[in-house]
Amino acid sequence: GDMLIEKTIKREVVLEEGTTAFKNWVKTGTTVYRQFWIFDVQNPDDVAKNSSKIKVKQRGPYTYRVRYLAKENITQDPEDHTVSFVQPNGAIFEPSLSVGTEDDNFTVLNLAVAAAPHIYQNSFVQVVLNSLIKKSKSSMFQTRSLKELLWGYKDPFLSLVPYPISTTVGVFYPYNDTVDGVYKVFNGKDNISKVAIIESYKGKRNLSYWPSYCDMINGTDAASFPPFVEKSRTLRFFSSDICRSIYAVFGSEIDLKGIPVYRFVLPANAFASPLQNPDNHCFCTEKVISNNCTSYGVLDIGKCKEGKPVYISLPHFLHASPDVSEPIEGLHPNEDEHRTYLDVEPITGFTLQFAKRLQVNILVKPARKIEALKNLKRPYIVPILWLNETGTIGDEKAEMFKTQVTGKIK
């Protein structure tokens, strides 16, 4: 009995035409939503003039349907037992699951003004940029609609810059009609314990963003893991959103629509400083903002974002050091709402439910040559938005899963 089930599982989780796994892998049967909460700045003038604490108020959720497009350019390589693909990006606004419309306005950090002196540190260039910031009537903060902020807008200051740069700015610009990848993953045909593990990303085994082993692409994309998952296992996965590989550890056993699943959670240890977790030393790439690598809970992903000062954290700076959250008022970190988890069915290794939570922040520093920033007395890691990307197996699929997998084992 058990041997037969094991044999069936091993056959059905292989990523090749005709298997259960392949069908769901090409196009997920799960509806995936991405909810956004925008941090609306309440005291922009006070911050710009007096370097006060930034008072924020989150507004949301604004919900989009994502990951509804099938993988493309799927190519099997029988030689090395891999399958390569790209994942197209798309987002459809869901008004019924949102508190407002895509035209709702927010006061947020001016992304271009904050990033410009960080990218162009030469004093002369900054003087030039300052004259253009003034000419375009730009300042430290700006008012933008949700649609503009997320998906892109033509920036008035950047439009005047006489350098060959992109003048469109947006937290996720460009997104629609783009693809993530190429991913090349093991199909598991020769070794089921390697199924879905990423062999390379964008043609490389390393990211070129981090020094040492931090640069490695480890594990799967978190949609599934090799079967027969044990509680003691650390689940490793790569997330292109945060430009790094990360891991989850067993948290609890839960019942999902009658299916026993293991909830794996991202531990606080993954966001710790090298002082608390020496393994993280290679994720600390600069010494000033990180207070000589003692700060924790924020990840500088600038190298992965063309040098822009982008920092990733958990929502509301959950698991971040006090120095990071101190200059921001209005944050309320909460483990249940703001942590990331994966509910993995242990026999198949399929992720049947997940909640990916992350926050996008921008570093803004005093810049003596930029009038809009010259009154700042300290750097701020400014929260722009946080997101909750969730997916749960549908009722129908869950029933099917129970009869075909868990039911047979019982």
Epitope: Y120, S123, V127, S131
Partner: antibody
């Protein structure tokens, strides 16, 4: 050490153009801006404009827009300034200079100057 | 455009005396003022950069002060080698503008 080597003196006819060169030595050309300064007994020192070869950024003093054109050739680490439609008002010593880049040291290194004389 | 008014136009001082040159700007430029020395037949030389910063290798008898719109350049004990023209430059905003210069001579 850092050096800015400028082209020699020029005697040019009114209405003609002249192209001055400035070869940068002893540093990475794309890391620092090169600025041009005009000096005459009457007007003293006047900033013409600057070019940052690394970002391809060029900015002019409005007064010299249309008169001066700044370019840079990364392969030879040389900056150029072309002056057009010359008149006697353009007779001056022209300097190319390099700043400190990041430390607020403006015009820290100077070339020896190119004397341009406009005369019929 | 920020106008820089430099005074005096010329100055005749005895060796060992204290020399003071002043530049006033038409707009607030924080401490973005620079000071240059130019000897005959030579290009100007940067002595003091933004933030009243004495450049490496420049003797400590040279100093500057000021913030906003009013700036002063000082030579504590004038030496014969200090005979030159002196210029201030504001680097706060474009276009960069120089003062008209001060000719320093020996009395």
């Amino acid at each position: 050490q850092v050096q800015m080597k400028e082209s020699g003196a020029e005697l040019v006819r009114p209405g003609a153009s002249v192209k001055l060169s400035c070869k940068a030595l002893g540093y990475t050309f794309t890391d620092y801006e090169i600025q041009w300064v005009k000096q005459t007994p009457v007007h003293g020192l006047e900033w013409i404009g600057g070019i940052h070869p690394g970002s391809s950024g060029i900015v002019y003093n409005q007064k010299f827009k249309g008169k001066a054109t700044l370019t840079a050739d990364k392969s030879s680490s040389t900056a150029y300034m072309e002056l057009s439609s010359l008149t006697s008002e353009d007779s001056a010593v022209y300097y190319c200079t390099r700043g400190g880049g990041y430390d607020g040291a403006w015009f820290a290194y100077w070339g020896q100057g190119s004397l341009v004389t406009v005369s019929a | 455009e920020t106008t820089v008014t430099q005074s005096p136009a010329s100055l005749s001082m005895a060796i060992g005396e204290k020399v003071t040159i002043r530049c006033i700007t038409s707009t607030d430029i924080d401490d973005d003022m620079n000071w240059y020395q130019q000897k005959p037949g030579e290009p100007p030389k940067l002595l003091i950069s933004e933030g009243n910063t004495l450049r490496p290798g420049v003797p400590s008898r040279f100093s500057s002060s000021g913030y906003g719109t009013d700036f002063v350049f000082t030579i504590e004990n004038m030496l014969s080698e200090d005979v030159a023209d002196y210029y201030c430059l504001q680097s706060d905003n474009l276009p960069f503008t120089f003062g008209s210069g001060t000719k320093l001579e020996i009395k």
